[in-house]
Amino acid sequence: FERTRSLQDPCSNCPAGTFCDNNRNQICSPCPPNSFSSAGGQRTCDICRQCKGVFRTRKECSSTSNAECDCTPGFHCLGAGCSMCEQDCKQGQELTKKGCKDCCFGTFNDQKRGICRPWTNCSLDGKSVLVNGTKERDVVCGPSPADLSPGASSVTPPAPAREPGHSPQ
């Protein structure tokens, strides 16, 4: 019965970008402005997403596809389909309830989102510190002495601790 009904259902002939208008003898009508249908056979068109405020339009709505939003400069997307915008911070900072705060000594963040993370502990891999970390950059671990071969970098001992944010040159 279902198969027979679908074969006889005039709405199944309505393509994406239209809807099956019950008020007009199930004629396929184009989606009204600011609405879309992404699949055929739909009895209604969906309202287009509107990118307002901190959201900006990345892709305009068409009769067959929804609008896509991203975030205005200074913010980045979070969640599926960019459902939220979160404030950017500078490299070397993390976002807290009180705004962007510098990473504590011994931690870093090399991105404009996310949290400050502890520097890599080179000794866990039996390696030594090749370059010291900063609040913007992780420590770089060097090969253990046994790994060194001709042409490879020699391992430098850890330099005295620097204030975070001062890159070793």
């Epitope: 870093f108 090399d110 404009k112 890599t120 913007e136 950059r137």
Partner: antibody, heavy 127, light 110 residues
Framework: EVQLLESGGGLVQPGGSLRLSCAAS????????MSWVRQAPGKGLEWVSV????????YYADSVKGRFTISRDNSKNTLYLQMNSLRAEDAAVYYC????????????????????WGQGTLVTVSS | QSVLTQPPSASGTPGQRVTISCSGS????????VTWYQQLPGTAPKLLIY???HRPSGVPDRFSGSKSGTSASLAISGLRSEDEADYYC???????????FGCGTKLTVL
């Protein structure tokens, strides 16, 4: 020895789709960031996308954002790039690249560069 | 147009020392590690320098990297014919949330 073997390239019409694969061997695939880098004929290198192994985070170049999707299957040691809505300017050799710095011990791979590369697969976009 | 600027070409004679520059900004080179790649004709790129100035195992000490502020340099001493290749600098750019490559420098050994 690190080995990366790309496949899936070919000729596609503008607006079409392709899925590239990169089979990895010779290292612990699940411990490393992986990137796709492309090079248009006679042009320079352009980074396309990176995927992290620990949190699955992904990042994309602005030129491909919303059209390309990077993914990985650690159980199959394989990296993927799904390319939709292809444009003429996407035509290039696509390289799969392994980053240095094994995770989770290493927190960030950016210092270590891309220390392993495949030989590339050619994507041609033409009508 | 790349956010990292490299000279399109450089040249030298065998035995000479050549330097290739790479200029960026505080959002990339200024606060992040620079890497350098060599691409010989018809081959995939190869990592030459990581973390601004360190050589992976197997890279000759003729190659050296340095960084100052928002600029980086690759120096090749004792130039050889087999060094003829394209050289690229690269780094992470936090404002773009992605990696960036320089446009490449074609090195010719005369």
């Amino acid at each position: 020895e690190v080995q990366l073997l790309e496949s899936g390239g070919g000729l596609v019409q503008p607006g079409g789709s392709l899925r590239l694969s990169c089979a990895a061997s010779g290292f612990t695939f699940s411990g490393y960031d992986m990137s796709w880098v492309r090079q248009a004929p006679g042009k320079g290198l352009e980074w396309v996308s990176v995927i992290y192994p620990d949190d699955g985070n992904t990042y994309y170049a602005d030129s491909v954002k919303g059209r390309f999707t990077i993914s990985r299957d650690n159980s199959k040691n394989t990296l993927y790039l799904q390319m939709n809505s292809l444009r003429a300017e996407d035509a290039a050799v696509y390289y799969c690249a392994k980053h240095g710095g094994q995770k989770p011990t290493t927190k960030s791979s950016s210092a270590y560069g891309m220390d392993g590369w495949g030989q590339g697969t050619l994507v041609t976009v033409s009508s | 147009q790349s956010v990292l600027t490299q000279p399109p070409s450089a040249s030298g004679t065998p035995g000479q020392r050549v330097t290739i520059s790479c200029s960026g900004s505080s959002s990339n080179i200024g606060n992040n590690y620079v890497t350098w790649y060599q691409q010989l004709p018809g081959t995939a790129p190869k990592l030459l320098i990581y973390a601004d100035s360190h050589r992976p195992s197997g890279v000759p000490d003729r190659f050296s990297g340095s960084k100052s502020g928002t600029s980086a340099s690759l120096a090749i001493s004792g130039l050889r014919s087999e060094d003829e290749a394209d050289y690229y600098c690269a780094t992470w750019d936090y404002s773009l949330s992605g990696y960036v490559f320089g446009c490449g420098t074609k090195l010719t050994v005369l």
